[in-house]
Amino acid sequence: SSSPTSSASSFSSSAPFLASAVSAQPPLPDQCPALCECSEAARTVKCVNRNLTEVPTDLPAYVRNLFLTGNQLAVLPAGAFARRPPLAELAALNLSGSRLDEVRAGAFEHLPSLRQLDLSHNPLADLSPFAFSGSNASVSAPSPLVELILNHIVPPEDERQNRSFEGMVVAALLAGRALQGLRRLELASNHFLYLPRDVLAQLPSLRHLDLSNNSLVSLTYVSFRNLTHLESLHLEDNALKVLHNGTLAELQGLPHIRVFLDNNPWVCDCHMADMVTWLKETEVVQGKDRLTCAYPEKMRNRVLLELNSADLDCDPILPPSLQTS
């Protein structure tokens, strides 16, 4: 085994009483911002649960991992991390749980090495379409981002703008085609009712897509065909009733895919026959033996893999004269 990195676990804290004196001068190259902990050995700065209202201006140039979680940032303006010289090595930025409700165009500009961004658990009522692309050009410079974590960013109902939340998020993902290199996208727990049909086709490099714990009812208009590199697709805890033939064929055609479908209210009627047949044959669904019917009542908790065609009937539609009120 090799020896530990120098001062491997040493996080130096800046002295709070120095903060006002330092802010009046140009920042020293490797000082630690007030209310933060820094480890040059680990190239890490942690400003966690400090109720910060803005991003510290005096971040050390060596930072590769920046944790700004549990603060009260409210707004990320354009160039929030732009510094001179730039934070050229900042690779992972975690802003989760920092009460952000607005991320403006160009908020992450001038971070040439930023590959992982976590904005989870922020009530993002206003996410600029150009938050990740930085400009409103039809084709922007490629973003270096490969992992974008946007779990639970849906604001409370009363704080939402008068527009589709799904549409706002997707606009930011697609603007300027800047995220063509994105490999991991997490959008769990966002109350999504639908997935705009064009979003996946324009993120061709995706390896991992997490849409769990949303309210997706159908995937009928969603195409997975272009996602030839997709390795995992998380659809647990949604409102899916059935997957139709087109979706089943597309998923089966993805060479490396693993699909997670637990805890959806599957409707086990005649429309489920194709999906049951597919489930019995496919290897792509993880934990497929756990999938159970939610409806109709007589089928509740039946295991999908144990159903046969005789179980999957649709009640005949009665002519109007025979329908009861």
Epitope: P4, T5, R64, S113, Q116, E147
Partner: antibody, heavy 121, light 107 residues
């Protein structure tokens, strides 16, 4: 003192399966991304797979994607590599290594001694 | 994925010599490059991280430089115990990759 100890290697037939383990001690295991790296006899080092500290993110070399699965049990301080559909070209010494820093900013500062996997009929 | 090319693949030098090994990335990787030393039958050992930072406990005769696509590992005064294979590794990409090594022998 940080220690990584691999086990589970051995002789397996083509198409067979094997599960490697790496027992970690001397550090807070869940705080570190971990990786498997292999080296075929007389050949270069090949990065195989990695996993984040929480286990929520996994990464695979194209050569093993769909056949190998990396996982970890943070309660047992153990890293795993499940290897299925093994091929002759998977024959190698498999090293477990610790990433220092996050996956996207890291270097491997500690390595185990390796365990030999031989795939042959 | 990012390819790493090392040169030379092998070299022979005398004790006291200054030795330089180069590593080239197929695209810019900023300074996300590490160097490892491996001796026969042993696990690799970290020498240099972040292109130029010396790992604790590694002799100061080892140094690293470079940024972007071209990187160099230098041994300022070769010692007998430096006989080994040296590997570069990039951690900029979504998948991390090693160069194929430079085998250094002592004359």
């Amino acid at each position: 003192e940080v220690q990584l100890l691999e086990s589970g290697g051995g002789l397996v037939q083509p198409g067979g399966s094997l599960r490697l383990s790496c027992a970690a001690s001397g550090f807070t295991f869940s705080s570190y991304a971990m990786s498997w790296v292999r080296q075929a006899p007389g050949k270069c080092l090949e990065w195989v797979s990695a996993i984040s500290g929480s286990g929520g993110s996994t990464y695979y070399a194209d050569s093993v994607k769909g056949r190998f699965t990396i996982s970890r049990d943070n309660s047992k301080n153990t890293l795993y590599l499940q290897m299925n559909s093994l091929r002759a070209e998977d024959t190698a010494v498999y090293y477990c290594a610790r990433y220092y820093g996050g996956y996207y900013s890291a270097w491997m500062d500690y390595w185990g001694q390796g365990t030999l996997v031989t795939v042959s009929s | 994925d990012i390819q790493m090319t090392q040169s030379p693949s092998s070299l022979s030098a005398s004790v006291g010599d200054r030795v330089t090994i180069t590593c080239r990335a197929s695209q810019s990787i900023s300074s996300f490059l590490n160097w490892y030393q491996q001796k026969p039958g042993k696990a690799p050992k970290l020498l240099i991280y972040a292109a130029s930072s010396l790992q604790s406990g590694v002799p100061s005769r080892f140094s690293g430089s470079g940024s972007g696509t071209d990187f160099t590992l230098t041994i300022s005064s070769l010692q007998p115990e430096d006989s080994a294979t040296y590997y570069c590794q990039q951690t900029y990409g979504y998948l991390h990759t090693f160069g194929c090594g430079t085998k250094l022998e002592i004359k």
